[in-house]
């Protein structure tokens, strides 16, 4: 008879035997035989394995290096890796969050469309007509031009995307 060529999902094929995989959080010490079960051992401190596996070594937890602006968002367990995030004012450079960069500021003429998070940078947008931003900021949105009319004033200097309108008194009619 032919030896098996496939095994069930929580098993693996070795020496014509279907052996049980090790559960998440444990590593393989020895394969099963006809009479002995697969031997598994828990991962050590600062190690993990997140799947049913036949690994002989556990993976090291990720190190959140403060020199790269990283801090621990979620501590790793024997079954999960550590999740890093960035210090306040910084965001990850990649999905794996291996390093951080300072949030970008929106230049004058641009406002913040979306404030940065630990994993995404600031999103800026040009100030449309009727709005302005005169500062470089990672938080400020475009502000609407001042409405001179509501203050019983007139526009003395038109606004731009970087400057507000300048209001002044209405010309008095001479008698």
């Amino acid at each position: 008879p032919e030896p098996p060529t496939a095994c069930r999902e929580k098993q693996y094929l070795i020496n014509s035997q279907c052996c049980s995989l090790c559960q998440p959080g444990q590593k393989l010490v020895s394969d099963c035989t006809e009479f002995t079960e697969t031997e598994c051992l828990p991962c050590g401190e600062s190690e993990f394995l997140d799947t049913w596996n036949r690994e002989t070594h556990c993976h090291q937890h990720k190190y959140c290096d403060p020199n790269l602006g990283l801090r621990v968002q979620q501590k790793g367990t024997s079954e999960t890796d550590t999740i890093c995030t960035c210090e306040e004012g910084w965001h990850c450079t990649s999905e794996a969050c291996e390093s951080c960069v300072l949030h970008r500021s929106c230049s004058p003429g641009f406002g913040v469309k979306q404030i940065a998070t630990g994993v995404s940078d600031t999103i800026c947008e040009p100030c449309p007509v009727g709005f302005f931003s005169n500062v470089s900021s990672a938080f400020e949105k475009c502000h609407p031009w001042t409405s001179c009319e509501t203050k019983d004033l007139v526009v003395q200097q038109a606004g731009t995307n970087k400057t507000d309108v300048v209001c002044g008194p209405q010309d008095r009619l001479r008698a």
């Epitope: 098996p4 496939a6 069930r8 999902e9 014509s16 099963c32 009479f35």
Partner: antibody
């Protein structure tokens, strides 16, 4: 309620073909490995085929290899057994065909876990006769 | 392929009796063995998995033991509803195989 319901059985001539279906309900079908098991009249149980949860891995009893094909459609919660192929259906394929769910019993405090077939359909009868 | 041999093939017993059915494997299968009960016209019902673990809802009078090549199913005190055919199955490797069955009849 967790249920399996087979259909597609009937009378078929030797050399003919048939497709059996097994409709699953009450559980996340796509997460489970599945099997077909048959029982000839007055005889014992015979394992026929296995399919993994994704459908990627299949296996067959030597008696049906090359003649039967197991497949599944997880979007429809359906398991199939196509009875055809070289020297297709024979008189000895006459049996009640059951679909059965493979379950992996696991207690995280225990060492290894174990498989068993915990849910069975009522069966569909296939009669191969001229 | 792994062969499973059940003994006895049939057994007559009375309500209240202690009954033992054995299943021998042609090669070591560790504890990858399940036991099923089947009544006429019905599908099999899982009783024991992993050689000795009782499936939920199965009465505690049923127990399984063994490892390697020799396994037993014990019913500590037979009840009228226990008269049926019992099968062992190895889930160690493909092809999965069943024993030929043990028919338990009322005396």
């Amino acid at each position: 309620e967790v249920q399996l319901l087979e259909s597609g059985g009937g009378l078929v001539r030797p050399g003919g073909s048939l497709r059996l279906s097994c409709a699953a309900s009450g559980f996340t079908f796509g997460s489970y490995e599945m099997n077909w098991v048959r029982q000839a009249p007055g005889k014992g149980l015979e394992w026929v085929s296995y399919i993994s949860s994704s459908g990627e891995t299949t296996d067959y009893a030597d008696s049906v290899k090359g003649r039967f094909t197991v497949s599944r459609d997880n979007s429809k919660n359906l398991l199939y057994l196509q009875l055809e192929g070289m020297n297709s259906l024979r008189a000895e394929d006459t049996a009640v065909y059951y679909c059965a769910r493979d379950v992996f019993f696991f207690d995280s405090s225990g060492d290894n876990g174990a498989y068993g077939m915990d849910v069975w359909g009522q069966g569909t009868m296939v009669t191969v006769s001229s | 392929d792994i062969q499973l041999t059940q003994s006895p093939s049939s057994l007559t017993a009375s309500v209240g009796d202690r009954v033992t059915i054995t299943c021998r494997s042609s090669q070591g299968i560790r504890s990858s063995l399940a036991w099923y009960q089947q009544k006429p016209g019905k599908p099999p019902k899982l009783l024991i998995y992993g050689a000795s673990s009782l499936e939920g809802g199965v009465p505690s009078r049923f127990s399984g033991s063994g490892s390697g090549t020799d396994f037993t199913l014990t019913i500590s005190s037979l009840q009228p509803e226990d008269f049926a055919t019992y099968y062992c199955q190895q889930l160690n490797s493909f092809p999965s195989t069943f024993g030929q069955g043990t028919k338990l009849e009322i005396k």
